[in-house]
Interface confidence: medium
Amino acid sequence: IPAPSIRLVPPYPSSQEDPIHIACMAPGNFPGANFTLYRGGQVVQLLQAPTDQRGVTFNLSGGSSKAPGGPFHCQYGVLGELNQSQLSDLSEPVNVSFPVPTW
């Protein structure tokens, strides 16, 4: 099933101690899906979208950037025929970096 879209959303982090907010959204015909956020191939967080919504926002606490490296991806799962879980393709990667202080 089609990949979700993924995006870093405001407020953006300015240091590694700041929280990171990543939104993930399934296509229009998949509301209420279960979403998984990955970083460097490892599961970071799981969230379920409300039954009338197509997306979730992962709120990662400060210091999450020190977790295993690599970009973030997300994926969603829905119940298909015979109540079997179907997993989407992985989203495109999204990168997180921190602005260089301009003092």
Epitope: S5, P10, P11, Y12, M25, T57, F98, P99
Partner: antibody
Framework: QVQLVESGGGLVQPGRSLRLSCAAS????????MHWVRQAPGKGLEWVAV????????YYADSVKGRFTISRDNSKNTLYLQMNSLRAEDTAVYYC?????????????WGQGTLVTVSS | QSALTQPRSASGSAGQSVTISCTGT?????????VSWYQQFPGKAPKLLIY???HRPSGVPDRFSGSKSGNTASLTVSGLQAEDEADYYC??????????FGGGTKLTVL
């Protein structure tokens, strides 16, 4: 106060290139996602592209994908739009706009726009 | 990337209320709350009026309000004033990286 000032527009022949700039001041430019939105004469608004606060993630409208490139220089507080292989239908006023500080809080600041005319 | 559907024009007398609709699909307006409204005067840049369906930025009069039902978002201008005469655009995300605008509605104050 927040100011976004676009420049670089003008008359250009089809197939040629142009680079637009958007100079930002009055806010911490490096902390905000930035968009380009255009408006053809007498027509509605059309989203063109967005770039993340740090420049690492970029997304484009299908109509410009592969021809336009959005970029930014946070050390100069400047947003750019490199437009290649221009077509007559790219004729429009091009606005730069900043994302809000809150989650999906809309495009809260806009420049005054710069007119790009593609004609032979 | 088809535009969201808005009426081409709307009108109302001074002091009255007028509502402008913005119809999309379950893939955009109906699938989340990321709907914004903008006001634009001729020859000027757009100005943000409403974000996340119903939130007003500071400085926007409370005469402007937003709502959503199903796949349709609405902007209501109550207590119409002459200076409200302008073009109004709705906006929504088709996916997280694809912003869409409505075709625009010209509001006339009679």
């Amino acid at each position: 106060q927040v100011q976004l000032v676009e420049s670089g527009g003008g008359l250009v022949q089809p197939g040629r290139s142009l680079r637009l700039s958007c100079a930002a001041s009055g806010f911490t430019f490096s902390s905000y996602g930035m968009h380009w939105v255009r408006q053809a004469p007498g027509k509605g608004l059309e989203w063109v592209a967005v770039i993340s606060y740090d420049g690492s993630n970029k997304y484009y409208a299908d109509s410009v994908k592969g021809r336009f490139t959005i970029s930014r220089d946070n050390s100069k507080n400047t947003l750019y739009l490199q437009m290649n292989s221009l077509r007559a239908e790219d004729t429009a006023v091009y606005y730069c706009a900043s994302e809000g500080v809150d989650f999906w809080s809309g495009l809260d600041y806009w420049g005054q726009g710069t007119l790009v005319t593609v004609s032979s | 990337q088809s535009a969201l559907t808005q009426p081409r024009s709307a009108s109302g007398s001074a002091g009255q209320s007028v509502t402008i609709s913005c119809t999309g699909t379950s893939s955009d307006v109906g699938g989340h709350n990321y709907v914004s409204w903008y006001q634009q005067f001729p020859g000027k840049a757009p100005k943000l009026l409403i974000y996340e369906v119903s939130h007003r930025p500071s400085g926007v009069p409370d005469r402007f309000s937003g709502s959503k039902s199903g796949n349709t978002a609405s902007l209501t201008v109550s207590g119409l004033q002459a200076e409200d005469e302008a073009d109004y655009y709705c906006s929504s995300y088709a996916d997280l990286n694809n912003l869409m605008f409505g075709g625009g509605t010209k509001l006339t104050v009679l």
